[in-house]
């Protein structure tokens, strides 16, 4: 027996303390407590970048990452040659883990992997890799860009030296230098199967907290084909603490990544709980705002040739602009109520703005959790007239996300609208 | 004012390719879609596909592997070509101007139709 | 592919009303054009977008949809409403891409 319903958007920008209200009529706190421990802090709201600062002293600090790289005013680093990398051909071991950090996806790196050269003080070990990714459809999401040009995503390597600390989190609490690697993905239209472990890993830590041991990767085949030419800066972590401890190697070339496998990013999800009161929702944006140069100077690599190749072609967006490769703005005014014990409906309204028109039909995909299961289906709404969508065989006990999305004529899509959340049988979400 | 007329009707022989061109003027194919129908004689409307304003082009399930539509939008023409015809493909051929909208197509300006009769 | 269905033929008598039909074989599709051809003509538009009339089209000629059927109505048929009806609609996208007519209604007034 459904008892009663509460549905609400999901809440994609990290709001904080949002209110709504149940049939009843009683308000439920969907979102967000402040942790006990570390001080909790988010990518927007009100425990937003802006607000990091009063948890994290250092994060208003004059040497913060991440930055727009300017090449024009870099300079060339004769000390900066060419990267020496050890153990980066290997394949990795069965004991490299990816983790939904609720933030972030990161993998854990079990085998030694070193990088030495560049300018950095020693010989470093990589520890663990980062991701960052925007909203959809190859939006910006990278955290450092190259003259104002930004990515969809940015996966970063951290480093320390095993010489002088026995962890990498020793390092960081005693404030002591560590490494990064800034490497950008940009849409192509193939497959890199490269990164198939990778994306394979994604897939089995869609929820927060989630954890999967990946499929054996090579990490030099995530990295650009050609290392010399990158970029030396010195900043700090773009999350809190945000210690200024960091020497940055930021990669002008970028890696390959198809729209389907960015689909498998825009597919995580952060959850919050605070007592009985949960908050489910797409981890997206989840970038830093970027930080000022201050008195700081960037440098470019001095090896040989690497920079003579023309960087028109991924510097130059080959795919034109946002509304060149989606067919529209999102849907919205998205709906879902409930039609008898066992059904609901889901309506929306037209796009605001249909770039490439006419709106054929909608693509109505919705997941649900059930005993730590997660399970997803899409179906075709064929009428463009009828903007509703009757999902039957509703499981009172799981909690369910919606997203509507239209199909042109061209086959293009738009962007997926706002996330409905709908749970049965509960009193609280 | 706004028009477009089709030519290069006439007499074919079975196995021959049709090519039919539709000349618009008043506006611009960069712009705006055209579609291809025809109708036998005493027969109703059939589509056979169309071209929209950025180019990509759309059969009708019988029409594909047979048909090609183009464009040049510089010429402001559009053409039609099929291949392989047969006394069934007698008809006359219009291109109508498509009014595409948010959420809908019709066609809100026909040319007045060249007529393509296939016969040994 | 979908079909739509017409009756062949219809009749009215002059300065009636009649309605002329046109049913989807499957439920809710896209929104229905009509279009009216005269003897040696091209097609013209009637209706767009089930209910909307292209201007210069008199207002005797309206359209409605329910369900998976688009009506054709004529207020007070005159003699040179004479004419084969058709409907169209539109379906699919991408190669699946389709612009469907129905196979038309032949409208005799009478009277």
């Known amino acids: 027996v459904l008892h009663y319903v509460v549905c609400f958007p999901a809440l994609t920008e990290g709001y904080v303390g949002a209110l709504h209200e149940n049939r009843h009529g009683s308000a439920v706190q969907i979102r967000r407590r402040k942790a006990s421990g570390d001080p909790y802090w988010a990518y927007s709201g009100a425990y937003g970048p802006e607000h990091w600062v009063t948890s994290s002293v250092s994060c208003g600090g004059r040497h913060q990452s991440p930055i727009d790289i300017l090449d024009q005013y870099a300079r060339v680093g004769e000390e900066y040659q060419e990267l020496q990398l050890d153990g980066f051909d290997n394949e990795s071991s069965n004991k490299t883990w990816m983790k939904n950090t609720g933030k972030t996806v990161a993998i854990l790196l079990k085998d030694d992997y070193f990088v030495s050269g560049a300018g950095l003080p020693g010989r470093f070990k990589a520890e663990k890799v980062e991701f960052h990714w925007g909203h959809s459809n190859g939006s910006a999401g990278s955290e450092h860009s190259i003259n104002g040009r930004r990515f969809p995503v940015e996966m970063q390597i951290f480093f320390y030296n095993p010489d002088d600390f026995d962890s990498f989190q020793t390092a960081i609490s005693e404030n002591r230098i560590i490494g990064a690697m800034a490497i950008f993905f940009q849409v192509s239209p193939r497959d890199n199967s490269a990164l198939d472990p990778i994306i394979h890993g994604l897939k089995g830590v869609v929820h927060h907290e989630k954890e999967t041991f990946l499929d054996p990767f090579v990490l030099r085949d995530l990295l650009p084909a050609s290392l010399g030419s990158y970029y030396r800066y010195t900043g700090s972590l773009t999350t809190p603490p945000c210690s200024e401890i960091v020497e940055w190697i930021v990669f002008r070339r970028p890696v390959p990544i198809s729209y389907h496998q960015l689909e498998a990013f825009y597919s995580i999800f952060t959850t919050e709980q605070q007592d009985h009161v949960k908050s489910v929702e797409y981890l997206r944006n989840n970038f830093r705002p970027q930080q000022r140069l201050h008195d700081r100077v960037v440098s470019k690599s001095a090896v040989r040739d690497s920079w003579n190749h023309d960087m028109t072609d991924f510097l130059e967006n080959p795919l034109g602009t946002e509304a060149s490769k989606v067919c529209s703005s999102p849907p919205i005014h998205m709906k879902v109520q409930p039609l008898n014990q066992t059904a609901l409906q889901v309506s929306w309204s037209q796009p605001e703005t249909i770039y490439h028109p006419p709106i054929m039909n909608y693509m109505i995909s919705y997941s649900w959790t059930k005993n730590e299961d997660e399970k997803e289906k899409t179906f075709t709404k064929d009428s463009d007239k009828d903007l509703k969508a009757t999902i039957s065989h509703v499981s009172p006990d799981s909690l369910y996300l919606f997203r509507v999305q239209a199909v042109c004529r061209n086959d293009m899509r738009s962007d997926f609208s706002q996330t409905m959340l709908f749970q049965a049988n509960t009193t609280r979400i | 004012q706004e028009q477009q007329k089709e030519s290069g009707g006439g007499l074919f022989k079975p196995t021959d390719t049709l090519t039919l061109t539709c000349t618009v003027s008043g506006f611009s194919l960069s712009s705006n879609a055209i579609s291809w129908v025809r109708q036998a004689p005493g027969n109703g409307l059939e589509w056979i596909g169309a071209i929209d304003n950025s180019g990509s082009a759309y059969y009708a399930t019988w029409a594909k592997g047979r048909s090609t539509i183009t464009r040049a939008t510089n010429l402001n023409t559009v053409t039609l070509k099929m291949t392989s015809v047969t006394a069934a493909d007698t008809a006359t051929y219009f291109c109508?101007?498509?009014?595409?909208?948010?959420?809908?197509?019709?066609?809100?300006?026909w040319g007045p139709g060249t007529l393509v009769t296939i016969s040994s | 592919s979908f079909v739509l269905t017409q009756p062949a033929s219809v009749q009215v008598n002059l300065g009636q009303t009649v309605s002329l039909t046109c049913t989807a074989d499957t439920l809710s599709r896209s929104y229905a054009s009509w279009y009216q051809q005269k003897p040696g003509q091209a097609p013209v538009l009637l209706i767009y977008r089930d209910t909307s009339r292209p201007s210069g089209v008199p207002d005797r000629f309206s359209g409605s949809s329910s369900g998976n059927t688009a009506t054709l109505t004529i207020s007070g048929a005159q003699a040179g409403d004479e004419a084969d009806y058709y409907c169209a609609t539109s379906d699919g996208s991408g190669s699946s891409y389709q612009f469907v007519f129905g196979g038309g209604t032949q409208l005799t007034v009478t009277g």
């Open positions: 109508a101007r498509e009014d595409v909208r948010a959420d809908s197509i019709d066609l809100n300006m």
